[in-house]
């Protein structure tokens, strides 16, 4: 006899990264006549939902608009169909951005290299702070972590044509609350014709993840589908 | 921009009731959650009830069946009904809101609030 009903789906939209007084919506998806969703934070109750009519609704959307620190953290949720209770949903890793400070970011030797030379990003942030993040724009919000008291460097090694891109970097204060994203500085790798001309524009970061969060944060536009990423969440783990 | 005013405490016995009302201004009250959370003597800020824009309740079990949340959006109101007053209920209550929200959301976390009133004190003495 089945104690527990399946695990729902959880994400943010438009995007698990928030600018700070922004509005965010965490959505956590499970079936069809579940009469209760609840939404956990950091291991207490954040929010309940009952949908009307619950054999129609499998989706309950809870907003948040007004995003903090106090709110930045990992969010649950579970539902229930009559007396039966869900396993939780994987963990929503939700940060708050736009805290505190700007970064600066720059890479040696320069924004144009040769395939093959060594790369490094330099992320420098002069307020308390001893976590930095190296995003990329592509398909998976690639997201690398740095350390150092000011400035952290992110070795890319030997590169490819595959390290193209447009790259950003935060400070961290912890795990839930950056700074202000920098100014994006683009890599542009130059290699053999043969092999340019067969590399892929990377494709590592979804064309309109970066794009609604940019939305989010100078217009506070919000678009009503999912963007979860599950490379950026399982990398602040 | 809302404003709560709380206002309805004051002091009753063991075993009374009270009636707590908290007026928001402006025309935002029909398009928010509501809730009343308190804070006794030395101790933290804790959720009592809470209600949505469809009036959904949800309480905590220490005042289940003895407090009852309710709203008037014609009068911009809320209401906490209160009776079997035990001591243990001797806090100031404050009342909260998040605006806006989605129709069935009721918040329990205190995070969740965006604005919040100052306050009526409700004493359960003999």
């Known amino acids: 006899q089945q104690q527990t009903l399946p695990k729902p789906f959880i994400w943010a939209e438009p995007h698990f990264m928030v600018p700070k007084e922004k509005q965010v919506t965490i959505c956590c998806q499970g079936n069809y006549g579940a009469v209760e969703y609840q939404l956990h934070f950091e291991g207490s109750l954040f929010a309940v939902d009952r949908p009307k009519p619950p054999e129609r609704i499998n989706k309950v959307k809870f907003y948040i608009p007004d995003m903090n620190s106090r709110m930045a953290g990992q969010y649950s949720c579970i539902y229930r169909v009559g007396e039966l209770w869900s396993e939780p949903s994987n963990l929503l890793d939700l940060v708050v951005t736009e805290m505190y400070d700007t970064p600066t970011l720059s890479v040696h030797p320069g924004p144009e290299v040769i395939s093959g030379e060594k790369v490094t990003f330099y992320c420098r942030l002069d307020t308390a702070t001893s976590m930095f993040l190296l995003l990329k724009e592509g398909r998976s919000s690639h997201v690398q972590r740095g350390y150092g008291k000011v400035q952290a460097e992110f070795p890319l090694g030997p590169v490819t044509t595959a390290h193209r891109g447009t790259y950003r970097c935060f400070g961290s204060y912890n795990n839930h609350a950056w700074s202000f994203p920098s100014e994006p500085v683009k890599l542009l790798v130059t290699g053999d014709i043969e092999n340019t001309s067969l590399a892929p524009e990377d494709p590592t970061f979804p064309a309109d993840t970066w794009g609604t969060y940019l939305l989010t944060t100078e217009t506070g536009l919000q678009k009503d589908h999912a963007l979860w990423d599950h490379t950026a969440q399982n990398l602040l783990r | 921009e809302v404003q709560l005013v709380e206002s309805g405490g004051g002091e009753v016995q063991p075993g009374g009731s009270l009636r707590l009302s908290c007026a928001a201004s402006?025309?935002?009250?029909?398009?928010?959650?509501m809730g009343w959370f308190r804070q006794a003597p030395g101790k933290g800020r804790e959720f009592v009830a809470a209600?949505?824009?469809?009036?959904?309740?949800y309480y905590a079990e220490s005042v289940k069946g003895r407090f009852t949340i309710s709203r008037d959006n014609a009068k911009n109101t809320l209401y906490l009904q209160m009776s079997s007053l035990r001591a243990e209920d001797t806090a100031v209550y404050y009342c909260?809101?998040?605006?806006?929200?989605?129709?069935?959301?009721?918040?329990?976390?205190?995070?969740?609030?965006?604005?919040w009133g100052q306050g009526t004190l409700v004493t359960v003495k003999p």
């Open positions: 402006g025309r935002t009250f029909a398009s928010a959650a």
């Open positions: 209600i949505s824009r469809s009036d959904d309740t």
């Open positions: 909260a809101a998040v605006v806006p929200t989605y129709g069935n959301n009721i918040y329990v976390h205190s995070a969740a609030y965006n604005y």
